[in-house]
């Protein structure tokens, strides 16, 4: 893979976005589950 300085920072940004998306999905599921159980 390249050592490009633009790509490097964008790759880190994409990883952060993926983690945020995953966490939002997990937390969203938990919230829906909690509402269902009430």
């Amino acid at each position: 893979h390249s050592d490009g300085i633009f790509t490097d920072s964008y790759s880190r940004y994409r990883k952060q976005m993926a983690v945020k998306k995953y966490l939002a999905a997990v937390l969203g599921k938990r919230y829906k589950q909690r509402v269902k159980n009430k």
């Epitope: 893979h1 390249s2 050592d3 490009g4 300085i5 633009f6 790509t7 490097d8 920072s9 964008y10 940004y13 994409r14």
Partner: antibody
Amino acid sequence: EVQLVESGGGLVQPGGSLRLSCAASGFSLSSYAMIWVRQAPGKGLEWVGIIYDNGDTYYASSAKGRFTISRDNSKNTVYLQMNSLRAEDTAVYFCAREPGSTTQNDLWGQGTLVTVSS
Amino acid sequence: DVQMTQSPSTLSASVGDRVTITCQASENIYNSLLWYQQKPGKAPKLLIYRASTLASGVPSRFSGSGSGTEFTLTISSLQPDDFATYYCQNYYNIWTNGAAFGGGTKVEIK
């Protein structure tokens, strides 16, 4: 030899379209972010847009909605599609490879002149 | 988009002079700054990346400093080959900020 060669420039009427090509040799373009930069006659450098290694694109406000950057990895070429051209788009257009943090250098094409005039 | 302001726009100097060019970002870009040299009819050439790291093959008389919003390019002892135009460029979070260049500084013979 590692190089970038632009082509496709020329004279076009206002409102017209043009597609510029940037052919890479000596390295695989697919691993790099590539940018387009333009320079109006006697003026400074203006960033036009970027295409990342995964194909994501981002544009300067002056290019948004009119210009599209794409890549064909099989041809080792990046393109700049320019639509609804205006007189103020007259410039030399350069493509460039992003700088490397270990190679510590960048790579630019020689530029291609686009003239928008009736 | 982040705006980059360079000063001065023109600088008259003599061989051997110490030359300083400044670049100001409209917001914090940390150390995500490039400096280029361009000669008439040629493509730009990278001098410095990450605000202060010298690019490959660039003479040590060139140096960069600064972070945040204020940056400086210094040529410690101007050589005949250094008469050219210099540009700074932001590359912090290009996906939201863009990658604007400064307006350029032309270094000419006094």
